[in-house]
């Protein structure tokens, strides 16, 4: 038994036929010693007398609000809730399994940007006697603060004969660092109580993995002279992180009729305009995705092809303009080749995601995972890799990126990747290894030496362990190169001489 909140207790029960249950001792919160009686819920039947009451809790009939009285006066209450465990698994009767992205997904969370603000939601078919309480933190062993509001009913839907209720909650990380590479996941814990049943649900994620931008805004069409083509332009959504030269999006532009089965024109672009072929009765739709990290696509923003007569052309807000000051990257050296670094880091992002397609979909966060990858270098909040830090002095950040590149380059060349099951030299991992080396050499030409981090002695003996470690390293590398790519894209746009 444990206290959920003041005067509310959860009794954990192994739930099987003829289970012995749990013996619970309740103590009346009073200085009084005698003349005390106990009742359950609205019943006036006296269950016992004295300052303590011992009960055997076996089923829901034994749960409820126990009250101690003296001479007709209520002294205190203790509400007992049951948390069922069947075959070693805690019950999940209250919430509906959303089955997306995988089975046993009860909580789903999304973030519109990297500000540390996110929304979680869950589904239930229960309409009454239901309460939720949400707690969250960054990391679990040494938790950092995340503040969540109250869960509210956000939608009601009819599903066949059943009504389905959607509840949602908004949370905000107390000291978020949008530009940093997350190393500890956000933990979300939801306590659900239906009548006398208690259940808890948890979710663990990195903000980067739950990013889903809002749709692009202000779609405009401009027909091109003497052509079937139309120039479509749009802007970054207002809710997306800024500056856009750092937090960049990529877009998918599609022209399609009302039916999904109809023919279509489709093009991907990093710009905020594109030229497509518009057809009568078709619509142009645009959606967005983080340019450097493969999280979710936004919903579509659409405009009909007919009446395509806007006077303005493409109005990109994808850069934040202005050639910044010429900063020294290395003491006594000169600025890095920002554009070359941008191109190579973009290639690294693509390679990191193609190195193992499964990596993007496997849930590799399991017991002890905080320890597994805490040896790898992360681009942290104080490393100067945020837009302001880069403007002030980019060398700190570049040094950190260089250390990380060398680290991962050595890891990808180590036994973890060279051992069984073997990888061929021109596999995506081989290309990734070569590109990491290429970028690190661009950052630190011959003659400059920054100190590099020691490579941990990770040498798993079993091939399956090696495979799992590869996945984890590649997952971590995807996050690292995404931040590096943002740094170089921003540098190329604002710091290039």
């Amino acid at each position: 038994i444990w206290e959920l909140k003041k005067d509310v207790y959860v009794v954990e029960l192994d739930w099987y036929p003829d289970a012995p249950g749990e013996m619970v001792v309740l103590t009346c919160d009073t200085p009084e010693e005698d003349g005390i009686t106990w009742t359950l819920d609205q019943s006036s039947e006296v269950l016992g007398s004295g300052k303590t009451l011992t009960i055997q809790v076996k089923e829901f009939g034994d749960a409820g609000q126990y009250t101690c009285h003296k001479g007709g006066e209520v002294l205190s209450h203790s509400l007992l809730l049951l948390h069922k465990k069947e075959d070693g698994i805690w019950s999940t009767d209250i919430l509906k399994d959303q089955k997306e992205p995988k089975n046993k997904t009860f909580l789903r969370c999304e973030a519109k940007n990297y500000s540390g603000r996110f929304t979680c939601w869950w589904l239930t078919t229960i309409s009454t006697d239901l309460t939720f309480s949400v707690k969250s933190s960054r990391g679990s062993s040494d938790p950092q603060g995340v503040t969540c509001g109250a869960a509210t009913l956000s939608a009601e839907r009819v599903r066949g004969d059943n009504k389905e209720y959607e509840y949602s909650v908004e949370c905000q990380e107390d000291s978020a660092c949008p530009a940093a590479e997350e190393s500890l996941p956000i933990e979300v814990m939801v306590d659900a109580v239906h009548k006398l049943k208690y259940e808890n649900y948890t979710s663990s994620f990195f903000i980067r993995d739950i990013i889903k931008p809002d749709p692009p805004k202000n779609l405009q069409l401009k027909p091109l002279k003497n052509s079937r083509q139309v120039e479509v332009s749009w802007e970054y959504p207002d809710t997306w992180s800024t500056p856009h030269s750092y937090f960049s999006l990529t877009f998918c532009v599609q022209v399609q009729g009302k039916s999904k089965r109809e023919k279509k024109d489709r093009v991907f672009t990093a710009k905020t305009s594109a030229t497509v072929i518009c057809r009568k009765n078709a619509s142009i739709s645009v959606r967005a995705q983080d340019r450097y990290y493969s999280s979710s696509w936004s919903e579509w923003a659409s405009v009909p092809c007919s009446g395509s007569g806007s006077s303005r052309g493409g109005s990109g807000s994808g850069g934040s303009g202005g050639g910044g000051s010429k900063l020294r990257a290395v003491p006594g050296g000169s600025s890095p080749a920002w554009t070359q670094c941008q191109q190579l880091s973009q290639k690294l992002c693509t390679l990191a995601w193609s190195a193992h397609p499964l990596v993007g979909h496997m849930d590799l966060r399991e017991e002890g995972d905080e320890e597994t990858t805490n040896d790898v270098p992360h681009i942290q909040c104080g490393d100067g890799c945020d837009p302001q830090g880069l403007r002030d002095n980019s060398q700190f950040c570049l040094q950190r990126i260089h250390q990380g590149l060398i680290f991962y380059e050595k890891l990808l060349g180590s036994d973890i990747f060279t051992g069984e099951p073997s990888l061929l030299p021109d596999s995506p991992v081989g290309q990734l290894h070569a590109s990491l080396l290429g970028l690190s050499q661009l950052l630190q030409p011959e003659g400059h030496h920054w100190e590099t981090q020691q490579i941990p002695s990770l040498s798993p003996s079993q091939p399956w362990q090696r495979l799992l470690l590869r996945f984890k390293i590649l997952r971590s590398l995807q996050a690292f190169v995404a931040v590096a790519a943002r740094v170089f894209a921003h540098g190329a746009a604002t710091l290039s001489p």
């Epitope: 023919k263 489709r266 093009v267």
Partner: antibody, heavy 118, light 107 residues
Framework: QVQLVQSGAEVKKPGASVKVSCKAS????????LHWVRQAPGQGLEWMGW????????EYAPKFQGRVTMTTDTSTSTAYMELRSLRSDDTAVYYC???????????WGQGTMVTVSS | EIVMTQSPATLSVSPGERATLSCRAS??????LHWYQQKPGQAPRLLIY???QSISGIPARFSGSGSGTEFTLTISSLQSEDFAVYYC?????????FGGGTKVEIK
Amino acid sequence: QVQLVQSGAEVKKPGASVKVSCKASGYTFTDYYLHWVRQAPGQGLEWMGWIDPENGDTEYAPKFQGRVTMTTDTSTSTAYMELRSLRSDDTAVYYCNANKELRYFDVWGQGTMVTVSS
Amino acid sequence: EIVMTQSPATLSVSPGERATLSCRASQSISINLHWYQQKPGQAPRLLIYFASQSISGIPARFSGSGSGTEFTLTISSLQSEDFAVYYCQQSNSFPLTFGGGTKVEIK
């Protein structure tokens, strides 16, 4: 299944015109874009243009603008590509292809060899 | 127009080996890049669309990657039926253009 069957080989003199046909089957003709791509002997592929059989809209590669005409006959589910003012360097295999997506080529015809020789 | 350059022009590989074919665009084309295979006397066949998307019916040994200006087609373990010419094609803007092709031949 979706199939494209093209007309037979042609031999033409320089300055003449050629009209290649491409008969579609296995799908609703107006549901796919139709493209024409050619390949000179021992050379690579060269896109010529596309037509939307639903409305007759066309887009031609600048290189062929004014010399090529693409048409369709929805009653027979057939597409046509006419190339005028033929030169010897127009000697090539001409392929039609169809796709629901405008910008790449999924289903290909077997090709029609057009030889331009005096 | 966007110029597509493929390298190498010819690639000699032994059956069972891995083949890596490159395609470079003269300007950034995001992931608007598609790969085709052509055997002698046959029409081309679509292998990969939008840089990395696989086509049903195409063996899993064919995979694509890349974005921007550099793209790669990888054949993980060459089978006898894979010896052919491979073309990349950009769909970023009209006119649609192809690379010059890479011939994969038996070593």
